[in-house]
């Protein structure tokens, strides 16, 4: 008789999840020699231990602490780039601007990027059929709690000027319910962070509006100011040209506004 299995509303664990996490860990240490001390088998064991045999709606930050400890990494605190709803461009930027880091440029972020995972209470099985959806099922699921934990730690580590890339094509350029809006903004440390600088990325070729005047940006400014952190905002009218100018800053066309 097949065992009854909880049906969740979200997609199941990414196929080859254990193999992918382990492979990513080894790849990360290969391309970041300063992280070669990391034992990837121990990292996988700690990752697995955070959610295996646990109810996937009852995961806590505490569950991830062994993994957080193994993945401890020092990134330059003044070179942090946060992003919201514009991951690809943020990653293209840090690929060119090698001294800046998104969360996914750190070991733990790299391990979990674009993956889904969950287990089942009281069995050592990984659930490849379905996992809890944040809205429809529960917020304390393995994936959401992981990103909340690493995002909080990443924001807490930031100092000086922190940059955030925001998607100007969305109805809510700043969304209080995003990871940036609900976690990172509230965990920037005012005693360390002087300024949050928002880069609003325009989508349309002919879009010349000043999106820094958008009501949601004003809302972000208000939240940040109340936390005793300065706020500044820049429009990035031409993201393609922006990246090109990061690559080749001496190009003559890079003096004009981008």
């Amino acid at each position: 008789v097949p065992r009854w299995r909880q049906q969740w509303s979200g997609p199941g664990t990414t196929k080859r999840f254990p193999e992918t996490v382990l492979a990513r860990c080894v790849k990360y240490t290969e391309i970041h020699p300063e992280m070669r001390h990391v034992d990837c088998q121990s990292v996988w064991d700690a990752f697995k231990g955070a959610f295996i045999s646990k109810h996937p709606c009852n995961i806590t930050e505490e569950d991830y602490q062994p993994l957080m400890k193994l993945g401890t990494q020092t990134v330059p605190c003044n070179k942090i780039l946060l992003w919201s709803r514009i991951k690809d461009l943020a990653h293209q930027f840090t690929q060119v601007q090698r001294d800046m880091f998104t969360l996914e440029d750190t070991l733990l972020g790299y391990l979990a990027d674009d993956l889904t995972w969950c287990g089942e209470f009281n069995t050592s099985k990984i659930n490849y059929q379905s996992c809890p959806d944040w809205r429809k099922d529960c917020s304390n699921n393995p994936v959401s709690v992981f990103w909340k934990t690493v995002s909080r730690r990443f924001a807490e580590a930031a100092c000086d000027v922190v940059h955030v890339m925001l998607n100007g094509s969305r109805s809510k350029i700043f969304d209080k319910n995003s990871t940036f809006g609900s976690v990172e903004v509230h965990n920037l440390q005012p005693e360390k962070v002087q300024t949050l600088e928002a880069w609003v990325i325009h989508g349309g070729r002919e879009d010349s509006r000043d999106l820094c005047q958008d009501p949601t940006i004003k809302e972000l400014e208000s939240i940040i100011s109340k936390r005793n952190i300065q706020f500044s905002c820049k429009n990035i009218y031409r993201p393609d040209k922006f990246l090109q100018c990061v690559k080749n800053p001496e190009d003559s066309s890079c003096t004009s506004e981008i």
């Epitope: 080859r16 193999e19 992918t20 492979a23 990513r24 080894v26 790849k27 290969e30 391309i31 020699p33 070669r36 990653h91 690929q95």
Partner: antibody, heavy 120, light 107 residues
Framework: QMQLVQSGAEVKKTGSSVKVSCKAS????????MHWVRQAPGQALEWMGW????????DYAQKFQDRVTITRDRSMSTAYMELSSLRSEDTAMYYC?????????????WGQGTLVTVSS | AIQLTQSPSSLSASVGDRVTITCRAS??????LAWYQQKPGKAPKLLIY???SLADGVPSRFSGSGSGTDFTLTISSLQPEDFATYYC?????????FGQGTKLEIK
């Protein structure tokens, strides 16, 4: 079994570009960093750069920074190395290579090599 | 970039001889060193990784030692198929670098 199969020999004119391919089989392409190494006739091996096939992220040796581009096609499990503004000193055997994850970060697997000849 | 200096650049030896090739790094590379064998017209073959670990399928007459800046590849009893060029490589940090090679010839 694990194989890296490279494209055939190329003869190129000075100032032109060459694009060498490396088709991977027998393993999950995105699980391993792919490196490119070259060897001029009678010379030592020279590391050129790497690509993470999963994300397309790259890093290059400073010497080649302005002239080399490493890309990949995930659907074809193939990595590419393009070298531009060719000069006679670029005449060499070009290899793709990867580690085994169990052998430190030494290159346990190599393509058969692609000879690129640059003539004026 | 880390420089690797191999010595000798060439050597002649006979079948059955014990042969030692050295590789010196310009800075500490811990044990992040590999040794390769290359025959004419062929791709290099990994012999030793992490300075002293034997790669799969490599005969036990090959051994590696050393850490830090000084490393050695030893072939305990030369066989006819061992006549080739040998390279050391550091993977401690980027850019990865190789030694200039040691050509092992039949005496």
């Amino acid at each position: 079994q694990m194989q890296l199969v490279q494209s055939g020999a190329e003869v190129k004119k000075t100032g032109s570009s060459v694009k060498v391919s490396c088709k991977a089989s027998g393993y999950t392409f995105t699980d391993y960093i792919m490196h490119w190494v070259r060897q001029a006739p009678g010379q030592a091996l020279e590391w050129m750069g790497w690509i993470d096939p999963e994300y397309g992220r790259t890093d290059y040796a400073q010497k080649f920074q302005d002239r080399v581009t490493i890309t990949r096609d995930r659907s074809m499990s193939t990595a590419y190395m393009e070298l531009s503004s060719l000069r006679s000193e670029d005449t060499a055997m070009y290899y793709c290579a990867r580690s085994a994850h169990t052998t430190g970060f030494g290159f346990a697997y190599w393509g058969q090599g692609t000879l690129v000849t640059v003539s004026s | 970039a880390i420089q690797l200096t191999q010595s000798p650049s060439s050597l002649s030896a006979s079948v059955g001889d014990r042969v030692t090739i050295t590789c010196r790094a310009s800075e500490d590379i811990y044990s992040n060193l590999a040794w390769y064998q290359q025959k004419p017209g062929k791709a290099p073959k990994l012999l030793i990784y992490d300075a002293n670990s034997l790669a799969d399928g490599v005969p036990s007459r090959f051994s590696g030692s050393g850490s830090g800046t000084d490393f050695t590849l030893t072939i305990s009893s030369l066989q006819p198929e061992d006549f080739a060029t040998y390279y050391c490589q550091q993977y401690n940090n980027y850019p990865y670098t190789f030694g200039q090679g040691t050509k092992l010839e039949i005496k």
